[in-house]
């Protein structure tokens, strides 16, 4: 039930941290103009990994694409890379472990085989989640460089009689989804990879021999002792099953290696 | 198509109150005061969102005027405190259209500071 | 604060003239976010409330004739009327619509010769 669970909860925290590596590969409010000590702005500014937006205070929006891949800085051009990159791993990383779900019947699929497809799974997601934060991350620090510097020539202009202000960009939401998106990937990912030992069965793992000890039967199995596997659970001479280690929730009365929960 | 109409001008003396109205119809985001005393050039008061009430103001009217809203009677209103002879003036309330611009205008209502 | 500013403050001209009014401002106007210099144009004449002319420096209001011509980026603009109309005897004024404040030059009467 536990190996179930960790699954299930790895599975549904992958699947929001995609969604939301996807809404922020999507959103536009990369990087946002920075509006100093005023709330209220006359044209605000915001940009995406696609597009660049311009909201006024009249309510009016417009948005224009980036319509050229040569003219854009090869950071963006990385960023977005990372990004696709975590996406279709991500898309890939859930296909495989829709399949590898312990509560999901097909055929007569292994449990070695369901605990390949939830470890292939768990590295995709951990592998999708750091490329999410990692293009996030080198987009911040893009952000970072450029607010510095645009702040060291604040006003330029010619004697110092025209001023121009320079448009100051700072971290918009997406980075903030980004992130988040990412790391739930990473732990969905993790959690995927530790529900996977838990449904590999063992290498050693032996028939088991009854020894009959007078007054009560004991069974022993070699390859050592597991939890709730052995003891007090059989003690009527039957085969000892262990499909890697189960919870008391998940014992059934005639195990075979094609059951399953 | 939108139309504003402004209403609540008059004569009052200095130091005293006024509020004006502008009964709105029509989509507006946004709204603006602009006021012009006799005789002279355009003067920006203040804005508001209309959907969130929030406002700006131009320094020389911060602390003595205040903008607001009624979205139930979809009117844009202005009130004035401690008002000066130099308030004196025909005063707009015009929507803010694509470009920030004020593409529609009331008719205007006078206001007059004299004792 | 932007300041505006613009010249002439009043001009004579006949009907059929080009006349050309140009406007200052103490900062850029042009939005790096979309290119567009936030610079509007407005007509008013005696008693009436201002017209919208054109907007971002050179759109040209719907319903407003094309004799009515802008231009120009950054800090320096320029409304033309390429052809001077009786019905276009009135005050201009430009408005920075960059940033808050708003602010409106002192305005240009075009009077009859």
């Known amino acids: 039930m536990a190996v179930t669970a960790c699954q299930g909860l790895g599975f549904v925290v992958s699947l929001i941290g995609i969604a939301g590596i996807i809404a922020a590969t999507c959103m536009d409010q990369w990087s946002t103009q920075d509006l100093y000590n005023n709330p209220v702005t006359a044209v605000f500014n915001y940009q995406g990994l696609w597009r660049s937006c311009v909201r006024e205070s009249s309510g009016f929006t417009e948005c224009r694409g980036y319509f050229t891949l040569l003219g854009l800085p090869a950071m963006l051009q990385a960023v977005r890379a990372l990004m696709i990159v975590g996406i279709v791993l991500g898309a890939i990383g859930l296909l495989v472990s829709i399949f590898a779900l312990k509560c999901i019947r097909i055929g007569s699929m292994e449990d070695s085989a369901k605990a390949n497809m939830t470890l292939t799974s768990g590295i995709m997601f951990i592998v999708s989640g750091l490329c999410a934060i990692a293009g996030v991350s080198v987009f911040a620090n893009m952000l970072v460089t450029n607010f510095w510097m645009s702040t060291a020539n604040m006003y330029t202009g010619m004697g110092g009689m025209v001023q121009t202000v320079q448009t100051r960009y700072t971290f918009g939401a997406a980075l903030f989804v980004g992130w988040v998106a990412g790391g739930l990937t990473l732990i969905g990912g993790v959690m995927m990879c530790i529900a996977c030992r838990g449904l590999a069965p063992e290498e050693t793992n032996y028939k088991a021999v009854s020894y009959h000890a007078s007054g009560h039967s004991v069974a022993y199995k070699p390859g050592g002792f597991k939890a709730s596997t052995g003891f007090g659970s059989n003690t009527k001479n039957k085969k000892i099953y262990d499909g890697g280690a189960r919870t008391e929730d998940e014992v059934q009365s005639y195990p075979s290696k094609h059951d399953y929960v | 198509e939108v139309q504003l109409v402004e209403s609540g001008g008059g004569l009052v003396q200095p130091g005293g109150s006024l509020r004006l109205s502008c009964a709105v119809s029509?989509?507006?985001?946004?709204m603006n005061w602009v006021r012009q005393a006799p005789g002279k050039g355009l003067e920006w008061v203040a804005w508001?969102?209309?959907?969130?009430?929030?406002?700006t103001y131009a320094d020389d009217f911060k602390g003595r005027f205040t903008i607001s809203r009624d979205d139930s009677k979809n009117t844009l209103y202005l009130q004035m405190n401690s008002l000066r002879a130099e308030d004196t003036a025909v005063y707009y309330c015009?929507?803010?259209?694509?470009?920030?611009?004020?593409?529609?205008w009331g008719q205007g209502t006078l206001v007059t500071v004299s004792s | 604060d932007i300041q505006m500013t613009q010249s002439p403050s009043s001009l004579s001209a006949s009907v059929g003239d080009r006349v050309t009014i140009t406007c200052k401002s103490s900062q850029s106007l042009l939005n790096s976010g979309n290119q567009k210099s936030y610079l509007t144009w407005y007509q008013q004449k005696p008693g009436k409330a201002p017209k919208l002319l054109i907007y971002w420096a050179s759109t040209l209001e719907s319903g407003v004739p094309s004799r009515f011509s802008g231009s120009g980026s950054g800090t320096d603009y320029t409304l033309t009327i390429s052809s001077l109309q009786p019905e276009d005897f009135a005050t201009y004024y430009c408005?920075?619509?960059?940033?808050?404040?708003?602010?409106f030059g002192q305005g240009t009467k075009v009077e009859i010769k």
């Open positions: 015009a929507r803010t259209g694509t470009g920030n611009t004020m593409d529609y």
């Open positions: 029509g989509y507006t985001f946004s």
């Open positions: 508001i969102n209309m959907y969130t009430g929030e406002p």
């Open positions: 408005q920075n619509a960059y940033s808050f404040p708003f602010t």
